[in-house]
Interface confidence: low
């Protein structure tokens, strides 16, 4: 009776179970009676990353410095190459295929966290008492400028976009 | 306009490091990075590293890792790049130059060289 | 490393003529070549970029083609003003790395 199952690492070809080629490496010949699988490495710029019976390698990933995108970690035989994007950019997506600049946290809003390779621009609005006057992919919101340290008084009120202004202590009368 | 200014020429001794700055004008520093490129006299142009102003991170030739050290100060948009423990072969032409974050872009804006030479 | 070779060495041209220089690369990297021109004492100046693609202020006379491993800059009618070294330059992978130059000459 025909065998219709192999074990793993296996594969079934005219009813016989022949060995899969292991990572790294693609398939040349089926096995045949007595003689084992045939199989050859892949060559430069190629890779497989499992137990196969690939009559082909995969190309390794192409970084196109277009998209903003460089090697991260080069690909072997076994291994893609994976990608990540230059300084200033994020990946678009969780494939890693282009890049996008950061986003800037507008006046009012702050850095709450730095964006990196894979992840963009966080910002949180600034809370009573702090303030940001700038469009930034770095600044946080600042403290309000404390008037009376400074022995002076608050002229003016600050707001999530605006320092306090600072003025001096008006002078009493005799 | 976009403008590098670099630091004046310097006379050196050997074994002594020298500071060489690059104060960057007329765009947002934080946002491009800044290389370095060698040049010895007569000879050709030499790719040193980068730094990204915006995070500090930078990139080195392994030729010059250990002999260039590169960084930046954002509050006066200058990027400085210190050469140790000089040689006469560290004697050369150093260029600051600008380049886009998209990888493929090019060194648009360069400053206008500063020579260092080693002699005692 | 990406080796980049330029070729010749030395070009000698009279003003007027069409004049191109060849840059080579150990392999391939798409179109990420650059090429900077810089006279005697000066600071290179960006010509053109990613193989083709002109740069605001440089004169129309310049061009690039190319991609793999082959580049051409090519002007198109040499001035006297055009005496420099020129300098192909990649940045498909770091480290970035420059042609050795060609010293264009006025006869």
């Known amino acids: 009776e025909p065998r219709t199952a192999c074990r793993e690492k296996q594969y079934l070809v005219d009813s016989q179970c022949c060995n899969m080629c292991p990572p790294g490496e693609k398939l040349v010949n089926d096995c045949l009676h007595t003689i084992d699988t045939e199989c050859t490495r892949c060559q430069t710029g190629e890779f497989l990353d499992t137990w196969n019976a690939e009559r082909h390698c995969h190309q390794h990933k192409y970084c196109d410095p277009n998209l903003g995108l460089h090697v991260e970690k080069e690909g072997t035989s076994e291994t893609d190459t994976t990608c990540t994007c230059d300084e200033g950019l994020h990946c678009t997506n969780a494939a890693c295929e282009s890049c996008t600049m950061h986003s800037l946290c507008p006046p009012g809003l702050g850095v709450k966290q730095i964006a990196t390779g894979i992840s963009d621009t966080i910002c949180d609005p600034c809370p009573i008492g702090f303030f940001s006057n700038v469009s930034s992919a770095l600044e946080k919101c600042h403290p309000w400028t404390s008037c009376e340290t400074k022995g002076l008084v608050k002229v003016q009120a600050g707001t999530n976009k605006t320092d306090v202004i600072c003025g001096p202590q008006p002078r009493l009368r005799a | 306009q976009v403008q590098l200014q670099q630091s004046g020429p310097e006379l050196v001794q050997p074994g002594a490091s020298v500071k060489i700055s690059c104060r960057a004008s007329?765009?947002?520093?934080?946002?491009?990075?800044i290389h370095w490129v060698k040049q010895r006299p007569g000879q050709g142009l030499e790719w040193i590293g980068w730094?990204?102003?915006?995070?500090?991170?930078?990139k080195y030739n392994e030729k010059f890792r250990g002999k260039a050290t590169l960084t930046a100060d954002t509050s006066s948009s200058t990027a400085y790049t210190q050469v140790s423990s000089l040689t006469s072969e560290d004697s050369a032409v150093y260029f600051c130059a600008r380049k886009s974050p998209y990888g493929n872009y090019a060194m648009d804006y360069w400053g206008q060289g500063t020579s260092v030479t080693v002699s005692s | 490393d990406i080796l980049l070779t330029q070729s010749p060495a030395i070009l000698s041209v009279s003003p007027g003529e069409r004049v191109s220089f060849s840059c080579r690369a150990s392999?391939?990297?798409?179109?990420?070549i650059h090429w900077y021109q810089q006279r005697t004492n000066g600071s290179p100046r960006l010509l053109i970029k990613s193989a083709s693609e002109s740069i605001s202020g440089i004169p129309s006379r310049f061009s690039g083609s190319g991609s793999g491993t082959d580049f051409t800059l090519s002007i198109n009618s040499v001035e006297s003003e055009d005496i420099a070294d020129y300098y192909c330059q990649q940045s498909n992978s770091w480290p970035y790395t420059f042609g050795g130059g060609t010293k264009l000459e006025i006869k």
């Open positions: 392999q391939s990297i798409g179109t990420s």
């Open positions: 730094i990204f102003p915006g995070s500090g991170n930078t």
């Open positions: 007329g765009y947002s520093f934080t946002s491009y990075y």
